[in-house]
Interface confidence: low
């Protein structure tokens, strides 16, 4: 066959859909690979062709668009399943072509089973709510395009296994779920089930997301350096190991990049000739406030190293702070034999 621009298997778009539910899958060519949309391609005389490779098979097959009740159909650049079956899992290819042009991309589609509590291998999106911040809402995701605006679906919300009814601070409002005042106890998986009729059949769309209650911006502060501090002096003799922890607390801030770094005599450790290593650990509170610890380590410190300036720096979207560690050389203990000899006036 003639040459075709093959974008390969687009594993970045691992599509997961639930068994026995409708699924609409757009050809990724127009979304991520080509600079024109389907309408432009169609009016230019290009044809969109779909085919697939079943799970654990190598053979590319045409998609059967003549199944009962049009279970699989194509509409413009969308492949429709009404509904999916477990054995629809496989790699799907959409190819755009005419006599002179050809471009195609494949993507994996996984049809996933869920249990009666909506547990499944589906990767769940995470929605963060601020703790005690006032009314916040989550919206049932990825249901656009499944039914016309004239159809009024029924939406039922669940927390874990339980239908949300008479919850104290969580109120279903159609496609939205309102949290009157989010608390740690609201952490969990929330599922909306959208039910709509189509041609005498009832279809369900199940969408689960994870709610994580996080620190409120009202309570956010600039980074706080707990260590080094003024109360601890790092006194070492040459040849000993010098260990200085820099421990910084960061309030949770949406999309903020938290950074901690050391400088030695105003330079990054990488720019200095001494043999220094830095190990980092990170821990999180229940509301995703972050504590970062960077331990600066010099295995065999020299007297020169003990005269240097060691400063811990921290930065977040709330600001930048720095704190110097108090480092000094240990004064050797008096050597009594010499002192006594001098005291007796030996000549």
């Amino acid at each position: 066959s003639e040459r075709c621009d093959d974008w390969g298997l687009d594993t970045m778009r691992q599509i997961q859909v639930f068994e026995d539910e409708p699924a609409r899958i757009k050809c990724p060519l127009f979304e991520h690979f080509l600079k024109f949309n389907y309408s432009t391609a169609h009016s230019a005389g290009l044809t969109l062709i779909w085919y697939w490779t079943r799970q654990d098979r190598d053979l590319e097959e045409p998609i059967n668009f003549r199944l009962p009740e049009n279970r699989i159909s194509k509409e413009k650049d969308v492949l429709w399943f009404r509904p999916t079956l477990l054995n629809d899992t496989g790699n799907y290819t959409c190819m755009l072509r005419n006599t002179t042009y050809c471009s195609k991309v494949a993507f994996p589609l996984e049809v996933v089973q869920k249990d009666s509590c909506f547990n499944s291998p589906m990767k769940l999106p995470v929605h963060k709510l601020y703790i005690e911040y006032g009314i916040q809402r989550i919206t049932c995701p990825n249901v656009d395009g499944y039914f016309p605006s004239s159809v009024k679906p029924t939406i039922t919300w669940y927390m874990g296994c339980y239908k949300i009814q008479n919850f104290n601070n969580v109120i279903p409002e159609g496609m939205n779920l309102s949290f009157l005042i989010a608390l740690i106890s609201n952490n969990g998986n929330y599922t909306c089930v959208v039910t709509y009729p189509e041609n005498g059949r009832t279809f369900h769309l199940t969408r689960t997301l994870t709610v994580k209650v996080v620190g409120s911006p009202k309570n956010a502060v600039p980074p706080v350096i707990h260590s080094p501090n003024d109360h601890v002096v790092y006194e070492k003799e040459p040849g000993e190991e010098l260990l200085i922890p820099c421990t910084v607390y960061f309030s949770f801030l949406m999309d903020s990049r938290n950074e901690v770094w050391w400088t030695i005599d105003g330079k990054k450790p990488d720019d200095i000739t001494i043999d220094v290593t830095i190990n980092e650990s990170i821990s999180h509170s229940r509301t995703e406030d972050e504590t970062r610890t960077q331990i600066l380590s010099i295995k065999k410190v020299t007297s020169e190293d003990l005269k240097r300036s060691y400063v811990c720096h921290a930065r977040s979207a709330k600001g930048e702070v720095a704190k110097a560690a108090k480092v000094k050389q240990k004064v050797p203990a008096p050597r009594y034999t010499v002192e006594l000899a001098c005291g007796f006036g030996a000549t």
Partner: antibody, heavy 124, light 107 residues
Framework: QVQLVESGGGVVQPGRSLRISCAAS????????MHWVRQAPGKGLEWVAI????????YYVDSVKGRFTISRDNSKNTLYLQMNSLRAEDTAVYYC?????????????????WGQGTMVTVSS | DIQMTQSPSSLSASVGDRVIITCRAS??????LAWFQQKPGKAPNLLIY???TLRSGVPSRFSGSGSGTDFTLTISSLQPEDVATYYC?????????FGQGTKVEIK
């Protein structure tokens, strides 16, 4: 307690009409989808019709389409089945059953509450 | 429309026996399947929904399994009060078809 009570059954001639009712109590009727199910003498169960909590969706088994109409009056906590052009094969005990909360297509609750049934006999 | 086929149509077993009733859907219905018990002259009673979830108050000797097209209802130790007709029902979409029923009797 949660209860469904059917009424309005009786003997009716073929071609005639009959309306049966189902009175709900003990739960928030307006929040639930409702169904009619029938059982001919000595036979199995046959699902007849569904109506969503807000009447936005109704569906019927093929054998009654165009003849039967399911409706509800949420202010009276009552479900109805209007049966027109009755046939001998419509003879059955008619049960109403509660569907899913908020009418979500009996997603996981199935038909958890049933009435005791009302007998409809179509005979000349 | 999806057809539901139950087997056997009737069975006779001794008290304490393990009883298995199967239900097959003509197309996949995921786990949208319920099992009902109906005693003579009474309304059906929901035993199991979502294929395997035991309804509150139903004895634990009843259990359900399966997904897709093949489902089973198991009574682990048959009791005299279990004499009844058992129906499966699919409820993924209308019509909410029932199986034809399985009549369970004591030997």
């Amino acid at each position: 307690q949660v209860q469904l009570v059917e009424s309005g059954g009786g003997v009716v001639q073929p071609g005639r009409s009959l309306r049966i009712s189902c009175a709900a109590s003990g739960f928030t009727f307006r929040s639930y989808g409702m169904h009619w199910v029938r059982q001919a003498p000595g036979k199995g169960l046959e699902w007849v019709a569904i109506i969503w909590h807000d009447e936005s969706y109704k569906y019927y088994v093929d054998s009654v389409k165009g003849r039967f109409t399911i409706s509800r009056d949420n202010s009276k906590n009552t479900l109805y089945l209007q049966m027109n052009s009755l046939r001998a094969e419509d003879t059955a005990v008619y049960y109403c059953a509660r569907g899913d909360y908020y009418g979500s297509g009996s997603y996981y609750d199935a038909f958890d509450i049933w009435g005791q049934g009302t007998m409809v006999t179509v005979s000349s | 429309d999806i057809q539901m086929t139950q087997s056997p149509s009737s069975l006779s077993a001794s008290v304490g026996d393990r009883v298995i009733i199967t239900c097959r859907a003509s197309q996949g219905i995921s786990n949208y399947l319920a099992w009902f018990q109906q005693k003579p002259g009474k309304a059906p009673n929901l035993l199991i929904y979502a294929a395997s979830t035991l309804r509150s108050g139903v004895p634990s000797r009843f259990s359900g399994s399966g997904s897709g097209t093949d489902f089973t209802l198991t009574i682990s130790s048959l009791q005299p009060e279990d004499v009844a007709t058992y129906y499966c029902q699919k409820y993924n979409s209308a019509p909410y078809t029932f199986g034809q029923g399985t009549k369970v009797e004591i030997k």
